[in-house]
Structures are given as C-alpha cells and as structure tokens.
C-alpha cells in the first residue's frame, strides 16, 4: 500500500476547526501478524528529506498521537490529553485517518506529517509518510470556512 494526502494545502481562518487527512491506498496486509500504527507531527518545509524532523503538535509529541490497529479497522480516540489540547484523532474502515485541530490560530500553521508504520512478524517494518501544509489566516471572520486544495492545481474544496 501507499499513503496519499487528498489535499496538500489547507487554508483556514483563525478560530475554525481544521481536519487534516491522510489515506492508505491499496491493500493493507491481512493476517494475525500485522499491526498498523499511525501518527502525526509537525515538520519543516525546507528539508532535503520531507518529514524527517519531528516537532510536537500543540505540545503533544507523535508518541502521544499514535493510533494503533490491525489493517483497516476503525479507531477513534478522544483521549483526555488530546482533548485538552483541542486535538482529535480518527481513522475509518476505508484507510482514511485524520487529525482535527480545534479553534486554530496562526501558531498552528506549518507542515503536518502523517506516518504509517506496518509491522509484520519476521519482516522489517515498513514506513510511509504523507505531508500537507496548514496556513491559518489571522483575524479572518468566523463565518468563513477552511479551504483544502492541491497546490499544483487551482481546484479547492471547503473542508471541515
């Protein structure tokens, strides 16, 4: 399988909720010996290797933001720690998984990375990355919503 990002750029007015999404495409290994771990972190745009630097999201590290399961099982956590920081993690049966940042501020702007680790008994682990940029516009009216797009094209969609 591989990890894709439906949108590479999210532009949100301050105060909105931003839901950033990654998607596992292709067949996920099935079987009793397969475990999938998913997590999120902030990184830097100017790196040779994207997503190699790992910075916390609202003071929560990628180890705090692990979602964990076998295959395409759904998982959803409203862990106290994440909730208190205005974050929510979700994952569905179709390979989509997301992080929601509530009430975004310009300080939330940056390059967000999702990491998927596939562990199989007696196999080396496999790691897949996705990245997307969040731009939070200061002082914009609370009536407007987040816009998600791919930077290379002009199509955009209103995001949650």
């Amino acid at each position: 399988f591989k990890v894709t990002t439906p949108y590479s750029l999210y532009v949100c007015p301050e105060g909105q909720n931003a839901t950033l999404t990654c998607r596992i495409l292709g067949p996920v290994s099935k079987g009793h010996d397969v475990t999938i771990y998913k997590t999120w972190y902030l990184s830097s745009r100017g790196e040779v290797q994207m997503c190699s630097e790992r910075r916390p999201i609202r003071n929560l590290t990628f180890q705090d933001l692990h979602l964990h399961h076998g295959g395409h099982q759904a998982a959803n956590t409203s862990h106290d720690l994440a909730q208190r920081h205005g974050l929510e993690l979700a994952s569905d049966h179709h390979g989509n998984f997301s992080i929601t940042l509530r009430n975004v501020t310009p300080r939330d702007s940056g390059l967000y990375c999702c990491l998927v680790i596939e562990l199989k008994n007696h196999h080396p682990e496999q790691r897949f990355y996705g990245s997307m940029e969040l731009q939070v516009q200061a002082g914009k009216g609370s009536g407007s919503t987040c816009m998600a797009s791919n930077e290379q094209d002009s199509d955009s969609i209103t995001a949650a």
Partner: antibody, heavy 117, light 107 residues
Framework: QVQLQQSGAELVRPGVSVKISCKGS????????MHWVKQSHAKSLEWIGL????????TYNHKFKGKATMTVDKSSRTAYMELARLTSEDSAIYYC??????????WGQGTSVTASS | NIAMTQTPKFLLVSAGDRVTITCKAS??????IAWYQQKPGQSPRLLIY???NRYTGVPDRFTGSGYGTDFTFTISTVQAEDLAVYFC?????????FGGGTKLEIK
C-alpha cells in the same frame, strides 16, 4: 520480532538504589514511548510512568515521584528506571511495556527486585 | 485518579463456558480501555485496545465492548489455555490505572 529484554533480578539491602534496564529490538526504538509498571501481590498492577523515547521527557504517577527516575539512551535503544532508597514496599516485579496508541502492546519479561537485609 | 473497579475477582468455569468480566471507571474514559491476559509466570499480553479492537493474533473468542464508564470483556467459549488473570486498564488520563484483576480458573 519485537522484543523488550529486561535486566536480571536484583536482591539489595534496604536504603540503596537500583537501576534496571529494558532494551528494545525488532522495531524503531524512538517511534514508541515506554511505560514502566510495578506488580506486587498487594497492589496488582500499578503504573509508574511513561518516557518519550524520542524527546526523553518523562511523565510520572505522582505516587512514584522521588522514588522512580526514568531515562533513555537512544544510541543503545535502552530505557532505564532507577528506584531510590529501596524499602520492603518496593519489592515487586517491574515491567517495561511499549506504548502504542492507548495500550501497552509488548511487555518485557519483568525484573524482580527484592529489598531485604 | 480514575479508579477502575473490576468484577468478579475470581471465576471458576468449565471449558466451553461463556465468561464475562466487567470494568467500571470512576469517571468517563471514552473508549480508552485495554484488556490484558497474564498467564502464570508470564508477562501481561495485550488482547483488546480501544475498548473493542482485538489485537493482532488474538483469537476471536475474545471480545470487548463499552464506552464511557462501563466496559465488558467476554470469552465466548473458554478453553483450557485461557487460565490466567485478566486486567482492564484506562489510558484516558494520567496516572494510567488498572483494574484489580480477575483470576480465571478452569474446573
């Protein structure tokens, strides 16, 4: 194959300190936090704390603050826990357990610590 | 601290029986509950996470359910090798806490 290999049993005099280790193999050590758990007959399982193996930050159960100190050595893929000023109350089996999501998915074999004169 | 009250403490059952263990949290823990099995002389082993997800390699006779404060762990058809102590654990907030354990014995 993911494994957590803990150091051997410790029999020590009351009042001294002991440092036990937990070496991770078969996975990227710094991708997962490490929990420490105490198991005694009296108290079943008690969570001591959690260390972030990437940043080195530790979160303690307030009950074990001043008693346990967790550290990590990334280069040797090893987590450590030092127990200070041992008393008979500290005699127990101590486990390290890998943090994954909201669970502890792999556990070490346990280290027995006995404080006795 | 969130207290996890696990019942019963002991279960004596026959192979083939259905077994249910309950865990009650002193406040809501959402679905941040895991269940572990500890066989005699061994380390605990993860069976269920996020309250109802079966961990890799765990037989489907083990199931978990619940949300908020009330959680249930079920073994649909007990087998001789299920002799063990079973623990629930909340990971919703620190300090993480465990139930007192349920010792399952086979007649």
């Amino acid at each position: 194959q993911v494994q957590l290999q803990q150091s051997g049993a410790e029999l020590v005099r009351p009042g001294v300190s002991v440092k036990i280790s937990c070496k991770g193999s078969g996975y990227t050590f710094t991708d997962y936090g490490m929990h420490w758990v105490k198991q005694s007959h009296a108290k079943s399982l008690e969570w001591i704390g959690l260390i972030d193996t990437y940043y080195g930050d530790a979160t303690y159960n307030h009950k074990f603050k001043g008693k346990a100190t967790m550290t990590v050595d990334k280069s040797s893929r090893t987590a450590y826990m030092e127990l200070a000023r041992l008393t008979s109350e500290d005699s127990a089996i101590y486990y390290c357990a890998r943090r994954a999501g909201n669970a502890m998915d792999y556990w070490g074999q346990g280290t027995s610590v006995t404080a006795s004169s | 601290n969130i207290a996890m009250t696990q019942t019963p403490k002991f279960l004596l059952v026959s192979a083939g029986d259905r077994v249910t263990i309950t865990c009650k949290a002193s406040q809501s823990v959402s679905n941040d509950i895991a269940w572990y099995q500890q066989k005699p002389g061994q380390s605990p082993r993860l069976l269920i996470y996020y309250a109802s997800n079966r961990y890799t390699g765990v037989p489907d006779r083990f199931t978990g359910s619940g949300y908020g404060t009330d959680f249930t762990f079920t073994i649909s058809t007990v087998q001789a090798e299920d002799l063990a102590v079973y623990f629930c654990q909340q990971d919703y907030s620190s300090p993480r806490t465990f139930g007192g354990g349920t010792k399952l014995e086979i007649k």
